[in-house]
């Protein structure tokens, strides 16, 4: 079953997908499509990479991570309700039926009316989890410290863009990443 992600109308949505290249720069083609992953390829392709670069894209769809190191997470800019649905991240590993397929469900919520600014308690209390950050060295574990005064709209942005606390890395535990080679 697909993993579910949420964003509000007007925000950027973030759909995580990772793989580990067998060697630096030894890239595997990846496609992103709207709709569940079919038997082959991606349906309704919105973005595609080859062994070197993004070679097809449609407006509002971007890879903002380092896809040359396997971060093929999709950013959808300025989402509308029409962006809701299943998205397929397909890592096209050479060989017959070797592809890895991830179905991610995007739920778009109507934008909230911004409430008056309120003091937010310690962010670790709201999101009490450890996260693994990716760098060039060994993985390290860190906790989130407290953030300055932020309103509920900002908290919503932090949570559903995921990158703001790098919670996307937790998705490795739920199978949204693959090692190649």
């Amino acid at each position: 079953s697909e993993v579910e992600y949420r964003a509000e109308v007007g925000q950027n949505a973030y759909l995580p997908c990772f793989y580990t290249p067998a060697a630096p720069g030894n890239l595997v083609p990846v496609c992103w499509g709207k709709g569940a992953c079919p038997v082959f390829e991606c349906g309704n392709v919105v973005l595609r990479t080859d062994e070197r670069d993004v070679n097809y894209w449609t407006s509002r769809y971007w890879l903002n991570g380092d896809f040359r190191k396997g971060d093929v997470s999709l950013t959808i800019e300025n989402v509308t309700l029409a962006d809701s649905g299943i998205y397929c991240c397909r890592i096209q590993i050479p060989g017959i039926m070797n592809d890895e397929k991830f179905n991610l469900k995007l739920v778009i919520k109507p934008a909230k009316v911004t409430p008056a600014p309120t003091r937010q308690r310690d962010f670790t209390a709201a999101f009490p989890r450890m996260l693994t950050t990716r760098g060039h060295g060994p993985a390290e574990t860190q906790t989130l410290g407290s953030l300055p005064d932020i309103n509920l709209t900002q908290i919503s942005t932090l949570a559903n863009e995921l990158r703001d606390s790098r919670l996307a890395n937790d998705l490795r535990d739920s199978g949204a990443t693959i090692r190649i080679g």
Partner: antibody
């Protein structure tokens, strides 16, 4: 509105180190990469390096031994540190946001001029 | 490193003329990107991924090319186009810029 603003020391003595801060607004540093580019007076653009949303970095190999790029997401700041400055490091230093897809820099700061002189 | 060579270094044109500047890469690249810079200002994104105009760029500008040869064309030059234009690639590290083409309006 997306903005980037550099702040630096202006004047640096030879062999000393340089620290420049890029303060951004209108977007989250966790969702975009930020690059550093410099331009010597009357010359072209030179890429120094960048920091990704997840904190990993890429550097120009010619300068890698002297460069360090880091950031503080909560303060929306990116930092450039360069060691062992010489007179040919005199330049205008820019930070710029990466648009995504390994493509181009869609928003640039106004730059900060750094002069290396005794 | 992929070296980008821009030509000509200086281009002089009269208003209304069509002009083309080129950028040659020492190795094949997937895309070329272009920036416009006027004296005293920061570079502005102008054309990305070879042929896509950045926001606010007039339609008289166009970009084309593939492999090692790319170009920026202005169909009818206007006085406000006077600037230096830089090409840039990031098909392989490090990211590199060309030395620039300075467009002067007669």
């Amino acid at each position: 509105q997306v903005k980037l603003q550099e702040s630096g020391p202006g004047l640096v003595a030879p062999s000393q180190s340089l620290s420049i801060t890029c303060t951004v607004s209108g977007f989250s540093l966790t969702g975009y990469g930020v690059h550093w580019v410099r331009q010597p007076p009357g010359k072209g653009l030179e890429w120094l390096g960048m920091i990704w949303g997840d904190g990993s970095t890429d550097y120009n190999s010619a300068l890698k031994s002297r460069l360090s790029i880091s950031k503080d997401n909560s303060k929306s700041q990116v930092f450039l540190k360069m060691n062992s400055l010489q007179t040919d490091d005199t330049a205008r230093y820019y930070c710029a946001r990466d648009r995504g897809n390994h493509w181009y820099f869609d928003v640039w700061g106004q730059g900060t001029t750094v002069t290396v002189s005794s | 490193d992929i070296e980008l060579t821009q030509s000509p270094a200086i281009l002089s044109a009269s208003p209304g003329e069509k002009v083309t500047m080129t950028c040659r890469a020492s190795s094949s690249v997937s895309y070329m990107h272009w920036y416009q810079q006027k004296p005293g200002s920061s570079p502005k994104p102008w054309i990305y991924a070879t042929s896509n105009l950045a926001s606010g760029v007039p339609a008289r500008f166009s970009g084309s090319g593939s492999g090692t040869s790319y170009s920026l064309t202005i169909s009818r030059v206007e006085a406000e186009d006077a600037a230096t234009y830089y090409c840039q690639q990031w098909s392989s590290n490090p990211l590199t810029f060309g030395a620039g083409t300075k467009l002067e309006i007669k």
